[in-house]
């Protein structure tokens, strides 16, 4: 009869033994993990993090979509509205390069570094060559006659823009377009002004920064987050909150990312910091991430979210504040007219595109997202997109503005700035990464429920016995 | 309030120089163009040219080109017009005047008077 | 060089009557019209902008017309306070212009 009991109460300790031990490894390797965590993830020679964020080990590419005015005379002498017809993608491989001058500041835990910029065209993945042509706005003529609304000095320039023989559209290469062209106009102007013009002239050889960013040594809960860009926690563009450097470069976020967070981040080519809030699980070739998107509140109106009021820098070409889905970066731009929005004017207000015809937009084309790993808040994918307009206003000192009616926010391009985890990097991460969490959790299951059922099993198997020894 | 004061009377000699200064107040004075007005006696008006003081870009009419020399002094929100081989057809009362926004002319100084007299 | 013939050089009203003054410019100027008013020892006075805009302050009897190569200015009920030299100046291009100048008397 002993040797039965003993039989079963061993069987219910190890079961109970089981458990617990199933039990306490929740909490201790939840402790294990975010150990583990904490020490890859800061920047600093060694760490996994620090190795990716040296030199991104996915390839990142942009794709330009421009927009090709199909009517330019009739807008001219007419002010019609402005036909478009998208031609692209066009794609260039970008952020190719490794991060230069980074230097470790161990007294505030900082990081410092430059982000070099550089972009190779890739013919495979485009539409055309860089030497295709396209009728867009006359960037010069536009940007010129915005900056100097001076009556006498846009006489001086309308002579200038006679003489060269510039019009209010022009014909330019993909290449000139982007990366930057001698402009006829501004080389007659008799005082010295850049007579290089490009949509994103100069780039190539240039760099973005410096920036400051916490290392996360002294709290991981701050790694990644930008302390100072170029020098300064704000940027002069913007009034009051609006004005600050808040959160990451979206390359990366501290780790332990909830859904119900609001995620910050500051992005250059817009001259501002903006948010992503959660919308779904994604699952990315194996591994699961929360997708965070741009919500519209980002861009509306002061009207429809009075947080967006100091994003409202001027009353006339905003309408009083109550046009949305565009934003006015001209003081980040040496004051030429740009205009940032999403692709076709997504969450646009219907009078920034009533002057535009041709536009679609949609959200799942046009829309930005930023796919991040939760526990490590790493971004595994991404869709950055965004449109570069340019405004262009009538002008009757400039002959070739002088017939316009109204205001108009020309679309110039559009772009798409994508990376996806490489399978290789992928299948590295669910295993050193997932799959390790994944085990883990497993084990602890498996322990908990066998321990679980083994206790169970003897402790009923036991009172059994006794019960019918006793009868 | 905007206000543009020029500098006093000049009797000078033929073949000289003269330096006549602008001194204004109450605006940005970088912004907006100075322009400068000749009026003989009697006589309508002629305009010399401007200068845009943000850059300095200078423009003339054909007729005062090597006669008149405009120049800024931002710093103290002055603008100057120096004559130079002076005669008896350059006796005259020039005006500086000042751009707004869209409009030419909206303000004047009050005038100086260049007597060119042996 | 536009070239802006303005006429007639003097005229002389009576108080309450209506005065025309007329512009005439070798180009076509559009409505890059402005009139001024100078009062013996005074600078000139901007009364009406381009595009035949009264400037603010300025009486409402004083107006302009015209487009192109031909403009008018008008006072609509002279007043003694309106005896003064008036002068329209062309600002479509460099060099800018103005016209001979109209002397307004009270008859």
């Known amino acids: 009869g002993c040797d039965r009991n003993c039989g079963l109460i061993t069987g219910a300790v190890i079961g109970a033994v089981l458990a617990v031990f199933g039990g306490i490894l929740m909490p201790v390797g939840d402790m294990l993990i975010q150990k583990t965590i904490k020490k890859e993830v800061v920047l600093e020679e060694g760490t996994i993090a620090f190795k990716n964020w040296v030199k991104t080990g996915t390839e990142i590419y942009r794709q330009f979509w421009i927009f090709d005015v199909q009517n330019p005379q009739e807008v001219m002498m007419n002010s019609s509205n402005i036909q478009v017809k998208q031609r692209g993608p066009y794609t260039y491989r970008v952020r190719f390069l490794a991060k230069e001058n980074i230097t470790q500041d161990p007294k505030d835990n900082t990081v410092s570094f430059l982000q070099p910029n550089g972009a190779i065209f890739e013919p495979s993945l485009s539409v055309g060559t860089e030497a295709d042509n396209f009728t867009v706005l006359n960037l010069a003529v536009a940007a010129a006659s915005h900056i100097y609304p001076n009556p006498f000095v846009q006489v001086v320039l309308n002579s200038l823009i006679n003489k060269s023989k510039s019009s209010m559209f022009q014909v330019r290469t993909l290449r000139e377009l982007l990366w930057g062209y001698t402009d006829p106009f501004l080389s007659l102007v008799p005082y010295p002004v850049s007579t290089r013009v490009g949509m994103f002239y100069p780039y190539n050889n240039t760099a973005d920064g410096v920036y400051k960013v916490f290392n996360g040594k002294d709290s991981i809960s701050k790694v990644a987050i930008i302390d100072t860009y170029k020098g300064k926690r704000n940027l002069s563009y913007w009034e009051s909150y609006c004005d600050m450097i808040n959160g990451t470069d979206a390359a990366s976020f501290p780790p332990f990312v909830e859904k119900s967070q609001v995620l910050q981040f500051f992005s250059s080519d817009i001259c501002r910091s903006i948010y992503a809030v959660f919308e779904s699980d994604v699952n990315l070739k194996g591994i699961p991430v929360y997708r965070f998107v741009l919500p519209s509140k980002a861009f509306a109106s002061p009207v429809q979210n009075p947080d967006n009021h100091c994003f409202c820098t001027e009353k006339i070409i905003s309408k009083n504040c109550t046009s949305y889905g565009v934003l006015d970066i001209s003081k980040c731009k040496e004051g030429k007219p740009v205009y940032i929005s999403l692709p076709h004017f997504l969450y646009a207000s219907p009078d920034v595109s009533e002057t535009i015809d041709g536009l679609n937009p949609n959200e799942e084309e046009h829309r930005t997202y930023l796919d991040i790993e939760p526990i490590t808040g790493f971004t595994l994918q991404f869709a950055k997109r965004l449109q570069v307009n340019l405004l262009v206003k009538p002008s009757n000192k400039i002959q070739v503005l002088k017939r316009l009616k109204r205001n108009y926010i020309v679309p110039i391009l559009w772009l798409n700035e994508t990376g996806t985890i490489g399978d290789e990097k992928a299948k590295m991460f669910r295993s050193q990464v997932t799959g390790k969490i994944n085990l883990l959790g497993l084990i602890e299951m498996i322990l908990l429920s066998v321990g679980v059922v083994m206790f169970v099993a003897f402790m009923i198997s036991y009172c059994a016995c006794r019960s019918k020894t006793i009868k | 309030q905007i206000q543009l004061v020029q500098s006093g009377p000049e009797l000078v000699k033929p073949g000289a120089s003269v330096k006549i200064s602008c001194e204004t107040s109450?605006?940005?004075?970088?912004?907006?163009?100075m322009h400068w007005v000749k009026q003989s006696h009697g006589k309508s008006l002629e305009w010399i040219g401007g200068i845009y003081p943000n850059n300095g870009a200078t423009k003339y009419n054909q007729k005062f080109k090597g006669k008149a020399t405009l120049t800024v002094d931002k710093s103290s929100s002055t603008a100057y017009m120096e004559l130079r081989s002076l005669t008896s057809e350059d006796s005259a009362v020039y005006y500086c005047a000042r751009d707004r926004y869209d409009v030419w002319f909206a303000y004047w100084g009050q005038g100086t008077l260049v007597t060119v007299s042996a | 060089e536009t070239t802006v013939t303005q006429s007639p050089a003097s005229l002389s009203v009576a108080t309450g009557e209506k005065v025309t003054i007329r512009c005439i410019t070798s180009?076509?100027?559009?409505?890059?019209m402005n009139w001024y008013q100078q009062k013996p020892g005074e600078p000139p006075k901007l009364l009406i902008s381009e595009g035949n805009t009264l400037r603010p302050g300025v009486p409402s009897r004083f107006s302009s017309g015209g487009y192109g190569t031909d403009f008018v200015f008008t006072v609509e009920n002279m007043l003694s306070e309106d005896v003064a030299d008036y002068y329209c100046l062309q600002s479509d291009n460099l060099p800018l212009t103005f016209g001979a100048g109209t002397k307004l008397e009270l008859k």
């Open positions: 109450g605006h940005t004075f970088t912004e907006y163009t």
């Open positions: 180009t076509d100027i559009d409505d890059d």
